[in-house]
Interface confidence: medium
């Protein structure tokens, strides 16, 4: 009975800061009663814990049971299909889920105009699930960087990409008029984590902000 069902073809994590989601692809020809069992293994404690006996979705939020991710050696997860009394073999994640797999994001970007500059402030993510002491800046305490992309509207091609090494940055507006849109992508220079571009924040410059600087 144990191997009558095919296994999920693939299982993987997609994670942002304290938002750790396990995904899998469905088995072929699954029925309306097919569901999926999820189990989790923490490196250093070599036993599998059952997390969900019967998930009918193709993803599962494991944040609550992986809150120590940023202080651990990581996790593996496995998923199998279940249909009544039948179940498939387990499909295990190909890679260790560790802090390195977390995609870095920002909370938001705030823009304001002051003395001829657009002042940008990058708000770091503050997920509700994160323990009080586990802030973005405490976990990634050094070498935080942010790539800044600026688009002039209308303008169909030029982005300016620069890196800043602080959560605050300034854009010189003198002599410029129009709408400017800014996106930010975080990184940590000492780490290999991917970063995700923030949503665009835009601000309009008019002649009233005109100043000359040298």
């Amino acid at each position: 009975h144990g191997t009558e069902l095919p296994s999920p073809p693939s299982v993987w994590f997609e994670a942002e800061f304290f938002h750790h989601i396990l995904h899998w692809t469905p088995i072929p020809n699954q029925s309306e009663s097919t569901c999926y069992e999820v189990a989790l293994l923490r490196y250093g404690i070599e036993s599998w814990n059952s997390i969900s006996n019967c998930s009918q979705t193709l993803s599962y939020d494991l944040t609550a049971v992986t809150l120590d991710l940023y202080h651990s050696n990581g996790y593996r997860a496995r998923v199998r299909a279940v249909d009544g009394s039948r179940h498939s073999n387990w499909t295990v994640t190909n890679t260790r889920f560790s802090v390195d797999e977390v995609t870095l994001t920002v909370g938001s970007v705030n823009l304001e105009i002051h003395n001829g500059f657009i002042l940008g402030k990058i708000q770091l993510p503050r997920p509700k699930m994160a323990p009080a002491n586990d802030t973005y800046e405490s976990i990634f305490s050094h070498f935080r960087e942010y790539e800044i992309a600026i688009r002039k509207v209308p303008g169909n091609f030029t982005f300016t990409h620069k890196k800043v090494k602080h959560e605050n940055f300034s854009l010189l507006t003198s002599g410029e008029v129009g709408e400017f849109c800014v996106q930010v992508k975080p990184s940590v220079a000492s780490r290999s984590n991917k970063g995700m571009w923030s949503k665009e924040e835009c601000i309009s410059l008019t002649r009233q902000y005109f100043t000359v600087t040298n």
Partner: nanobody, 124 residues
């Protein structure tokens, strides 16, 4: 094809001068700020100077203030960097880049519309 081309580099003695040019083809520079930046061997790329699209506003790195002057001729679709009182530490490849705005307190990361660079060597 969108392209920026730098020229005017060369070998010059300490205290000498050079004038770098940044010319655009395939698009007009007058809608964009222009950055000059440089990269010396084994060092990070650093911003040198930036000029706003109108040409009214300019910024300079502390290391070149009073010695370098940035200007633009939108009719010729060209931006210039006049470099006086050159020092050996100015030796680098100099690049220009089209920008939406000048940015302060940052270094250029790319990618973007920037050229292949022109070598400036200051040596006696």
């Amino acid at each position: 094809d969108l392209q920026l081309v730098e020229s005017g580099g060369g070998l010059v003695q300490p205290g000498g001068s050079l004038r770098l040019s940044c010319a655009a083809s395939g698009f007009t520079l007058d809608s964009y700020a222009i950055d000059w930046f440089r990269q010396a061997p084994g060092k990070e790329r650093e911003g040198v100077s930036c000029i706003s699209s109108s040409g009214i506003s300019t910024t300079y790195a502390d290391s070149v203030k009073g010695r370098f002057t940035i200007s633009r001729d939108n009719a010729k679709n060209t931006v210039y960097l006049q470099m006086n009182s050159l020092k050996p530490e100015d030796t680098a490849v100099y690049y220009c880049a089209a920008a939406a705005l000048c940015m302060s307190g940052t270094y250029y990361a790319g990618p973007g519309y920037w050229g292949q660079g022109t070598q400036v060597t200051v040596s006696s």
